[in-house]
Amino acid sequence: VPRWRQQWSGSGTTSRFPETVLARCVKYTEVHPEMRHVDCQSVWDAFKGAFISKYPCNITEEDYQPLVKLGTQTVPCNKTLLWSRIKDLAHQFTQVQRDMFTLEDMLLGYLADDLTWCGEFNTFEINYQSCPDWRKDCSNNPVSVFWKTVSRRFAETACGVVHVMLNGSRSKIFDKNSTFGSVEVHNLQPEKVQALEAWVIHGGREDSRDLCQDPTIKELESIISKRNIRFFCKNIYRPDKFLQCVKNPEDSSCLSGIHHHHHH
């Protein structure tokens, strides 16, 4: 007799979730020698321990601490790239600019990127049918709490000049309710972070507006300045050109460096 299972509004755990996490962990430690000390079986056990047998609307950051401890990793100063609502371009950028890192270039972010997971209270099963939706069910679900936890840690450990890529095509270029706006901005440490530099990515080809003057960017500047961190903003008018110039900086059309305005 199939046992009763809570029906949530969100999609269920990604198929082959344990295998995917383990495979990613192995691949990551193979490719990043500095993480060779990581035992992927222990990482999976800690990951599993954070949500298995727990009510999936009552997950806490504390549940993820054993995993966070195992995945401890530092980014060199000036090399942290945050992003909001523009993940693909941020990842394309760090794939080319190999010495800069988004959260998904770090072990824990890499493990969980694009995956969904949840368990059930008092059973050892993974729920492949449905998981809580952040809006319709609850915010303290395994996936949301994971990203809040690791995003907080990522921001806390950043130092030097921190960069953030923002989507200029959205109505709120800076959204206080995004992970960047609600978690990362507030966890940058003023004693370690000298400045936040925002890169506003333009969507339209003929869009020559200065989006650094957008009210939401001004709001971001205000929040950052109040935290005693300097703020800079750049328009990236042609993201395709921008990536091309990162790949080939010697290209004659890249030498002028006139693709963006720069604001203090």
């Epitope: 082959r16 295998e19 383990l22 495979a23 192995v26 193979e30 490719v31 992927c40």
Partner: antibody, heavy 121, light 107 residues
Framework: QVQLVQSGAEVKKPGSSVKVSCKAS????????INWVRQAPGQGLEWMGR????????NYAQKFQGRVTITADESTSTAYMELSSLRSEDTAVYYC??????????????WGQGTLVTVSS | EIVMTQSPATLSVSPGERATLSCRAS??????LAWYQQKPGQAPRLLIY???TRATGIPARFSGSGSGTEFTLTISSLQSEDFAVYYC?????????FGQGTKVEIK
Amino acid sequence: QVQLVQSGAEVKKPGSSVKVSCKASGDYFNNYAINWVRQAPGQGLEWMGRIIPFLDDANYAQKFQGRVTITADESTSTAYMELSSLRSEDTAVYYCARATSPLYSYYFDYWGQGTLVTVSS
Amino acid sequence: EIVMTQSPATLSVSPGERATLSCRASQSVSSNLAWYQQKPGQAPRLLIYGASTRATGIPARFSGSGSGTEFTLTISSLQSEDFAVYYCQQYNNWPWTFGQGTKVEIK
């Protein structure tokens, strides 16, 4: 005791493909990375790639990307290495190899006996 | 990819003598280095991993040292069964790469 037993010698024509098998016994197969290493006559060793059967996860050396496919059949504890578009330079002894530790494939404690593949017209 | 260079290509040693084999990496591989022994018609056999840790069942006369780019395999007193080809292998960066080998022959 772990044993890796490979399929027999093969003679192949240029342009064709070869599929070498490696059957593991004496240990739990699925969690261990099976690697393939080749050695041309009188030459050194060359790592080609690896698979972790349980994770269905294969990785290849850039040199062989697109020409080599490593697969595994968990039910028979057998790994396979298929090399396509064969040329005379692919004449070599092909070894499967495994590490002691589950999941990892850094260095190799256990080796198959080797399979000689000769490519000749 | 990381290029591993072994020297000498051939080493002639009398039984009972000490043999010192060298392996150099084109860039740092930390301590992620292994040594293998291979006899004619046989598969390689793991001797050392982690640059200096002896594999299970390997006699104490085999020792490894070094880190970064310079590594050494020392056989303190050569026995007749030690005459073979020795390979180093780095497992720091994809793809894993081997040296071209050092043949230890009877003098």
